[in-house]
Structure formats: structure tokens, C-alpha cells
């Protein structure tokens, strides 16, 4: 193939791969109709200049995961129909002035995962067609004015897991083709008003992981057709009441890992198509009502780890079509019987770990399609009779960790769980806390004549009868409806992938597999 | 349907105590939240507070902390309210009320005169 | 606490005219509004929620609007029996509270 290197592998659509730690040096010759190059997990150190000087018609260069840390200004000489550069996962700490000189027809540069420590207006002032450009994982400090100003169409831009603690509200402002602008994992401890406000065709801005305290209230005012916005894991304490106004589109917001102690009224909204909100490890102690009654759209609502104690009856208002609601790990003691009442179309909800002493019977009342109830590691002692027998899509409901007390006002509950086990999953069952004599015994199997008899004894001791139909779906616990195995942040559909870490930790948010990715 | 049908007046001295009561009727007693609502007259209305009945968790208004207390005795599904250390800033029509499908007060008592007075 | 505050003690309106009575919050409350009608010897009587909606029984001829700090009741068509006394009372966050009340003349 019009010669190729021993180190390398050429293929007939004059794709090149160079890779292996014997190589110290591009390899020569390269076939002079190469399109596309890789020099992957070498032990290169410099590129010198013009290496690539007789394959003109290379679109693609890959020169990554090297020990690469100098790079000759005229290294990429020639190379006027490269598309794709990337220099990622070097050690390049300095890159010199002029290095992309004549890669007209350049789109995307990839400088992420290096040790660089500062870019000049002067490095991308040539790259005027560039629309994407990677320089996560890097250790810059602050971005100069001017930097990105030629780059007007750019779409993409990753600054993330750099050492940024502030950001000029001049840098972004040429930049009105950006899409994606990805921040997260700096050290920024507030965003100037205006920032963003040349941003007007940004669909997703990422700002997880940083220490931003305050937003401005128009931060995002002139960004009307973001669509995903992440803020978590940040050290926001309040919301200015306008802060989300003027986001018609947003359809992701992530809060989570922040100091939120309360929700202001009209926060969220309008904003039709939000479909997820993710407000778990706050500081929240209370929800009013009409809190989310703007978000007509939310499915998933995440609410778990805060410190909820009171939950107005019209809290959900508007939520009909909220599928998902997580309210595990709170201080939950009491729920007026209407405060579910317009969740029509939920599936599963998450109650486990709060101090819930009794639920009222018709707590579920509208919430006919409910699959899953988690509602272990409470203080219930007895059910309410028939709460739920109009729930036939049922398949797992969790009680166990709860202090039942196994008298003769249990027997309804028992006789429904008897005919209802598989519901309850096999890992672990309710058992009987009180009296002392049936304490530790599986609920399902107690014999109640055994156990002190209660006051009054019900005249029909049975709830009505729901049997478990076979053929409705069960669920094994590791694939649950709310497995308890999940991300710890929710899927941020990043290419990059750079903030998903999965964890075994128990007690993060309760839910459905389709949704922890 | 749903009532709330509360105690009869009272005269008391100042200094004493009264407890003023609030059957309920028409729902599950232990379900909902009972409030108790205070009206002077000519002086608009002032929230006191709010009890659970299924847990007899209560939450009250700081000004009346100390002043009024909320209990419930469910097996008459009864709502109750103490006030202590009487004054004539007591004087007031009490009511209780029950939040419907949000955190305002949909169903009323009729409300309980109350008079202190030596 | 937040103070919701009616400018008007009294207002005088004849049968048939139309009336605007107007609630000021101390701070953002969203919607979280009720309007209650208290007519002499009576419980107040929930007129509408959420700032405008309706409660169950209630003449269209009574609506409400505004979110945030102000407020209005607007009675169209004015009636006798509407002779009574208007509370505002917020819901948002604790200690709930109420405005002093505006009564409402039949000329």
C-alpha cells in the first residue's frame, strides 16, 4: 500500500495505525495517500518538524496516549485537508504559537488529558473553521480574553477538569454557534452576570463540580435553547427566584450535592419540557406547595438524602406526569392523605429510610399505575386495610427494617402479604417487632394466635384479595425496578464520559435501571 | 362529607386555662393535618399551628408556642386545643380547619368563642 | 414572618359593578394564595387557591390573580350576598399568614 512502516498496520481505506512502545519516532514512510493516522501508546516524546510532510490528504490524525511533551511549531506543516487533530492523553505542558498555521480545514482538536498550563488568543487564531475543541483534563488556570474569539464556529467546547477559579464574562462572547460548553470540575467559586449571554444557540452547559455559591439571576437569561443544565455537587445555598426563567427547553437540570435549604416559589418554571430534576443531598427541609407545578413534563423527580420533614398536600401539583419519585433518606414522619393525590401516572417511589409511623389509607388512592414502593427502614408498625389493593401493576414492594407489631390488627396485612410474597422480593422480609414473644419472626409466616391479642380485632381479617399473577413481570433484585445499585449522578450523555463513576453504595437514590444508565 | 364541628363558648378568668375541642366527621381523622386558626375581632386571623393526628406531630406559629397546645384523641377523632396563662389578648373566636388538596383551609369549624374575663 | 397587607379596610361597590381587591406580600410567594370570604357569624369560606383556581362551588363571577408579591380578587357582577369580609392568606412557608381584611359595602 504505496509503502508502509513494519511498526504500522495499513489498511485498503488508507487508514494507518502506529502503536507500541518501540516506536520513538513517526514512523517513515507513511503511504502518501493516507486519510487517516493513529500513533497510539508509543513512546514518542517530540514531534519535530513537518513528519507528515508527504501525506498531504491526511483528514484525520490521532497522536494519543504517547509520551509526546514537545511539539516543533511546524510539526503539522502540509496538512491543509486535516480535519481531525488529536493530541490528547500527552504530556504536552506548552504549546507553541502557531502550531495549527494552515490547518484550514480543520473541525475538531482534541488537546484534553495533558499537563497544559495556559493557551493565548494567538494559539487558535488561525483555527477559524474549528467546531469542536477538547481541553478537559488539563491544568489551566484561567482563560485570557480574546482566547476562542476567532473560533465563531465553534460548537463544541470541553474545559473541563482544569484549575479554573474564574471565568471572564468576555471569553464566550463571540461564540453565539456553541452548543456544548462544558466547565465542570474547575475550582470557579461564582459566574459573572453575563457570562453566557452571547451563548444563544447553547444546548447544554456543564458546571458539576466546582465551588459556585451564588448565581446571578440572569445568568442564563439569553440562553433560551439550553437543554441540559448541569449545577450539581456545587456550593449553591439559595436560588435566585428568575435564575431558571427563560429556559423553555430545558429538559435535564441537575442539582444535586449542593446546599439548597429551601425551594423559592416559582423556581422552576416555566419550563414544559423538563423531564428530569435531580435535588438529592441538599439541605432541603420542607416542600410548599406548587413548588414544581410548572415542570408539566418532569418524570423523574429526585428529592432523596435531604432533610424533608414536611411535605405540603400540594406539593406535586402539576406532576401528572411524573414517573418516577424519590423521597428516600429523609425526616419524613408524617404524609397528608392528599399529598400523592395527583401523581396519576407513577410508577415507582422511594420512601425508605425516614421515620413514617403510619401512612394514611388512601395515601395511594389516585396512583393507580404504581410498579414499585419502597418503603423499608421506617417506624411502621401496621398498614392501613386494603392500601393496596387497587394496585395491580404492583411487583415490588419493600417493608422490611420496619417495627411491625404482630397482634391480631396485623392479620389483615399478613393474609395480603401471603398471597402477594413474590411482591416482596427474596432478599429480606418483614418481621415482627413486637410483642417480644414473636420479635424477629417473619410477619408472612407468624402465627397471631401466639402473639398478644390487640384491643379490638377486625370483623373481616383479610385485606381483599390481589393474587400475584404470574405473568406479570417480576423483577430479580440485581435488575429491580429501583435497584439500589446506581450511578451516583445521572448519565450526563457526555462523549468523554468524564464524570460517570458507578458505586455500590446502598442508600443513593432508589431507582429504576433505565434511568441510572 | 367532611365536618368539623368544635366546642361551645367558654368564659374563663384570666390566668386559667381552656380547652376548646374540634370533632371531626366525614374522613379518616388520622389522615389529614387539623389547623387551628385565631380570629380577634376587627384583627383579621392568625394561624397557630397544625397537629398530625395519625402521629400527634405538631408544628405551631412561634407567637403561640408556649401559649396554646395541640393534642388529639383518635378513637373519638377529636381534635383538641390548650391555652395557658389566659390574658384578655386571649379574647378571640378559635376555629379549627382541614387543608383539602393543598395547604389552605378548605373545610372549617364553626368556630369557638372564647372569653377572658374577671 | 411575611406580611400580606390590604390597603383597603372598606370598600363600597353597588350591585352589579365590578370590584378589585387588592394583597401585598412582603416577599415572593409564588402562587401559594388563598382568597377566603367571611360573612358576619360565619367561618371563612375558601374562594380561591393557587392564586387564581376556583374552589368547588364558587361563582365564576369571583376570580383571582397575580403570583409573587401581588395579589387581586376581582368580584364582576357584584351581588348582594357578596356583602362580607375578603382575607388574603399565604401558604408558601411558615407561620402561614393572613391580611387584615377588606369589607365590602353594598352600596
Known amino acids: 500500500y504505496h509503502g508502509c512502516p513494519s511498526e504500522c498496520t495499513c489498511s485498503r481505506a488508507s487508514q494507518v495505525e502506529c502503536t507500541g512502545a518501540r516506536i520513538v519516532a513517526v514512523p517513515t514512510p507513511l503511504p502518501w495517500n493516507a486519510m487517516s493516522l493513529q500513533i497510539l501508546n508509543t513512546h514518542i516524546t517530540e514531534l519535530n518538524e513537518s513528519p507528515f510532510l508527504n501525506i498531504s490528504a491526511l483528514i484525520a490524525l490521532r497522536i494519543e496516549k504517547n509520551e509526546l511533551s514537545r511539539i516543533t511549531p511546524g510539526a503539522f506543516r502540509n496538512l491543509g485537508s486535516l480535519r481531525y487533530l488529536s493530541l490528547a492523553n500527552n504530556k504536552l505542558q506548552v504549546l507553541p504559537i502557531g502550531l495549527f498555521q494552515g490547518l484550514d480545514s480543520l473541525e475538531s482538536l482534541l488537546l484534553s488529558s495533558n499537563q497544559l498550563l495556559q493557551i493565548q488568543p494567538a494559539h487558535f487564531s488561525q483555527c477559524s473553521n474549528l467546531k469542536e475543541l477538547q481541553l478537559h483534563g488539563n491544568h489551566l488556570e484561567y482563560i485570557p480574553d480574546g482566547a476562542f474569539d476567532h473560533l465563531v464556529g465553534l460548537t463544541k467546547l470541553n474545559l473541563g477538569k482544569n484549575s479554573l477559579t474564574h471565568i471572564s464574562p468576555r471569553v464566550f462572547q463571540h461564540l453565539g454557534n456553541l452548543q456544548v460548553l462544558r466547565l465542570y470540575e474547575n475550582r470557579l467559586t461564582d459566574i459573572p452576570m453575563g457570562t453566557f449571554d452571547g451563548l444563544v444557540n447553547l444546548q447544554e452547559l456543564a458546571l458539576q463540580q466546582n465551588q459556585i455559591g451564588l448565581l446571578s439571576p440572569g445568568l442564563f437569561h439569553n440562553n433560551h435553547n439550553l437543554q441540559r443544565l448541569y449545577l450539581s455537587n456545587n456550593h449553591i445555598s439559595q436560588l435566585p427566584p428568575s435564575v431558571f426563567m427563560q429556559l423553555p427547553q430545558l429538559n435535564r437540570l441537575t442539582l444535586f450535592g449542593n446546599s439548597l435549604k429551601e425551594l423559592s416559589p416559582g423556581i422552576f418554571g416555566p419550563m414544559p419540557n423538563l423531564r428530569e430534576l435531580w435535588l438529592y443531598d441538599n439541605h432541603i427541609s420542607s416542600l410548599p406547595d406548587n413548588v414544581f407545578s410548572n415542570l408539566r413534563q418532569l418524570q423523574v423527580l429526585i428529592l432523596s438524602r435531604n432533610q424533608i420533614s414536611f411535605i405540603s398536600p400540594g406539593a406535586f401539583n402539576g406532576l401528572t406526569e411524573l414517573r418516577e419519585l424519590s423521597l428516600h433518606t429523609n425526616a419524613l414522619q408524617d404524609l397528608d392523605g392528599n399529598v400523592f393525590r395527583m401523581l396519576a401516572n407513577l410508577q415507582n417511589i422511594s420512601l425508605q429510610n425516614n421515620r413514617l409511623r403510619q401512612l394514611p389509607g388512601n395515601i395511594f388512592a389516585n396512583v393507580n399505575g404504581l410498579m414499585a414502593i419502597q418503603l423499608q427502614n421506617n417506624q411502621l408498625e401496621n398498614l392501613p386495610l386494603g392500601i393496596f389493593d387497587h394496585l395491580g401493576k404492583l411487583c415490588e414492594l419493600r417493608l422490611y427494617d420496619n417495627p411491625w407489631r404482630c397482634d391480631s390488627d396485623i392479620l389483615p396485612l399478613r393474609n395480603w402479604l401471603l398471597l402477594n410474597q413474590p411482591r416482596l422480593g427474596t432478599d429480606t422480609v418483614p418481621v415482627c417487632f413486637s410483642p417480644a414473644n414473636v420479635r424477629g419472626q417473619s410477619l408472612i409466616i407468624i402465627n397471631v394466635n401466639v402473639a398478644v391479642p390487640s384491643v379490638h380485632v377486625p370483623e373481616v381479617p383479610s385485606y381483599p384479595e390481589t393474587p400475584w399473577y404470574p405473568d406479570t413481570p417480576s423483577y430479580p433484585d440485581t435488575t429491580s425496578v429501583s435497584s439500589t445499585t446506581e450511578l451516583t449522578s445521572p448519565v450526563e450523555d457526555y462523549t468523554d464520559l468524564t464524570t460517570i463513576q458507578v458505586t455500590d453504595d446502598r442508600s443513593v437514590w432508589g431507582m429504576t435501571q433505565a434511568q441510572s444508565g | 362529607q367532611v365536618q368539623l364541628q368544635q366546642s361551645g363558648p367558654e368564659l374563663v378568668r384570666p390566668g386559667a386555662s381552656v380547652k376548646i375541642s374540634c370533632k371531626a366527621s366525614?374522613?379518616?381523622?388520622?389522615?389529614?393535618?387539623i389547623n387551628w386558626v385565631k380570629q380577634r375581632p376587627g384583627q383579621g386571623l392568625e394561624w397557630i399551628g397544625w397537629?398530625?393526628?395519625?402521629?400527634?406531630?405538631?408544628k405551631y406559629n412561634e407567637k403561640f408556642k408556649g401559649k396554646a397546645t395541640l393534642t388529639v384523641d383518635t378513637s373519638s377523632s377529636t381534635a383538641y386545643m390548650q391555652f395557658s396563662s389566659l390574658t384578655s389578648e386571649d379574647s378571640a373566636v378559635y376555629f379549627c380547619?382541614?387543608?383539602?388538596?393543598?395547604?389552605?383551609?378548605?373545610?372549617w369549624g364553626q368556630g369557638t368563642l372564647v372569653t377572658v374575663s374577671s | 414572618d411575611i406580611v400580606m397587607t390590604q390597603s383597603q379596610k372598606f370598600m363600597s361597590t353597588s350591585v352589579g359593578d365590578r370590584v378589585s381587591v387588592t394583597c401585598k406580600a412582603s416577599?415572593?410567594?409564588?402562587?401559594?394564595v388563598a382568597w377566603y370570604q367571611q360573612k358576619p357569624g360565619q367561618s371563612p369560606k375558601a374562594l380561591i387557591y393557587?392564586?387564581?383556581y376556583r374552589s368547588s362551588g364558587v361563582p365564576d363571577r369571583f376570580t383571582g390573580s397575580g403570583s409573587g408579591t401581588d395579589f387581586t380578587l376581582t368580584i364582576s357582577n357584584v351581588q348582594s350576598e357578596d356583602l362580607a369580609e375578603y382575607f388574603c392568606q399565604q401558604y408558601n412557608s411558615f407561620p402561614y399568614t393572613f391580611g387584615g381584611g377588606t369589607k365590602l359595602e353594598i352600596k
Open positions: 380547619a382541614r387543608w383539602g388538596y393543598g395547604a389552605y383551609f378548605t373545610y
Open positions: 393557587s392564586a387564581s
Open positions: 366525614g374522613y379518616t381523622f388520622t389522615d389529614y393535618y
Open positions: 397537629i398530625y393526628p395519625g402521629s400527634g406531630n405538631t
Open positions: 416577599q415572593n410567594v409564588g402562587i401559594n
